[in-house]
């Protein structure tokens, strides 16, 4: 169970694959696409709001927590929309919903090598967000050796060192990068 209903912290970050392709979102009221693609040189990277929650460490899960606790995250590309795991379809979807969020929106955060992370479904341990055919999908990882397989590894980073922000009032934040410094406190996220 998740301890408390409020996140312990929130960060705004770009999400890219192990091979440095960007995760991008094209979102309308009634439809969306999630792409894994190389961006143009002048194109800004999409950001996701990562909300970190502390959870009790269940015995059948292997999160990177301490003292019997682990970190879970939700990922939001814009206000009121969150990534969801659809375990039946093995797909990663965007859903508009209100809090409290369903379990399908929570992912156990694993800190991996080379400043990479992976996202394990709270609702289906052993199943991770991964990349398949230039789209996000749910990928079953059979053994701990496969936890380092490249297609489930992601980077929360940017070339701009001031890109990761600790979010203040993130739910109302929709402005551009130029104004970000005035809305956020710079915060380094250590893996």
């Amino acid at each position: 169970s998740i301890t408390g209903i409020s996140p312990i912290t929130e960060y705004l970050a770009s999400l890219s694959t192990y091979n440095d392709q960007s995760i991008t979102f094209a979102l309308e009221d009634e439809s969306y696409e999630i792409y894994v693609e190389d961006l143009k040189k002048d194109e800004k990277k999409d950001k996701v709001l990562l909300s970190y929650y502390e959870s009790q460490h269940p015995s059948n899960e292997s999160g990177d927590g301490v003292d019997g606790k682990m970190l879970m995250v939700t990922l939001s590309p814009t206000k009121d929309f969150w990534l969801h795991a659809n375990n039946k379809e093995h797909s990663v979807e965007l859903h508009k919903c209100e809090k409290p969020l369903p379990d399908q929106a929570f992912f156990v955060l694993h800190n991996m090598h080379s400043n990479c992370v992976s996202f394990e479904c709270k609702t289906d341990p052993g199943v991770f967000i991964g990349v398949k055919d230039n789209h996000l999908a749910l990928i079953k990882v059979d053994s701990s050796e496969n936890l380092c397989t490249e297609n489930i590894l992601f980077k929360l980073s940017e070339t701009n060192p001031a890109f990761l922000y600790k979010v203040v009032g993130a739910a109302d934040y929709k402005d551009d990068d130029d104004k970000a410094a005035h809305h956020h406190h710079h915060h380094h996220h250590h893996h």
């Epitope: 979102f25 979102l27 009221d29 143009k40 194109e43 999409d46 950001k47 929709k174 130029d178 104004k179």
Partner: antibody
């Protein structure tokens, strides 16, 4: 169905003011950045101004900076353009346009104009 | 800001291919969009992100963008494609349009 309906155009003398409105329907207005684009008679398209979904960020072409003010009322699903110190060269059809996609966190301006209104004519002449 | 240069006019016979160029410094580093405007009507988005077509836009419309030139191609041009076409990019949160190209179907 997405609909954008401009109003407020008309004839105004040089140095005068005009306020354009764009009533939006058929989508979640506050989620999208909006722009004003104008077209002088027989000429091409010129981007004028834009505003983020929340209204917290505004952007202007150099040709109107300091004279025009873009704003929005998300409770009324309406976009505005306050035009002051009007000049003859501001004569044009003014279109409001919606971004193709919902603005993301820290999005700035980068999406194409997916939907356009029918335009309202502004004539600046003495 | 980049200046986007388009040919003022392009003529094409029905069923033939029409290519409209849009030139600007480092054009290939940005995403280009293309709009179609018929007389007395509002513009319509026909290509975005260089190559993608919005729903409802016929497959005969395609786009490319590299180097300093973006190109809109209409293959198998029809009479209904006669219109003005404008390219557009964003540069530092400023919208920039090309001067427009009038496509005439002979």
């Amino acid at each position: 169905e997405v609909q954008l309906l401009e109003s407020g155009g008309g004839l105004v003398q040089p140095g005068g003011s005009l306020r354009l409105s764009c009533a939006a329907s058929g989508f979640t207005f506050s989620s999208y950045a909006m722009s004003w684009v104008r077209q002088a008679p027989g000429k091409g398209l010129e981007w004028v101004s834009a505003i983020s979904g929340s209204g917290g960020s505004t952007y202007y072409a150099d040709s109107v900076k300091g004279r025009f003010t873009i704003s929005r009322d998300n409770s009324k699903n309406t976009l505005y353009l306050q035009m002051n110190s009007l000049r003859a060269e501001d004569t044009a059809v003014y279109y409001c346009a919606r971004d193709l996609w919902i603005q993301l966190w820290g999005g700035g301006l980068r999406y194409p104009f997916g939907y356009w209104g029918q335009g309202t004519m502004v004539t600046v002449s003495s | 800001l980049p200046v986007l240069t388009q040919p003022p006019s392009v003529s094409v016979s029905p069923g033939q291919k029409a290519s409209i160029t849009c030139s600007g410094e480092r054009m290939g580093d940005k995403y280009a969009a293309w709009y179609q405007q018929k007389p007395g009507q509002s513009p319509i988005l026909v290509i975005y992100q260089d190559t993608k077509r919005p729903s409802g836009i016929p497959e005969r419309f395609s786009g490319s963008n590299s180097g300093n030139t973006a190109t809109l191609t209409i293959s198998g041009t029809q009479d209904m494609d006669e219109a003005d076409y404008y390219c557009q990019v964003w540069d530092s949160s400023t919208g920039v349009f090309g001067g427009g190209t009038k496509v005439t179907v002979l």
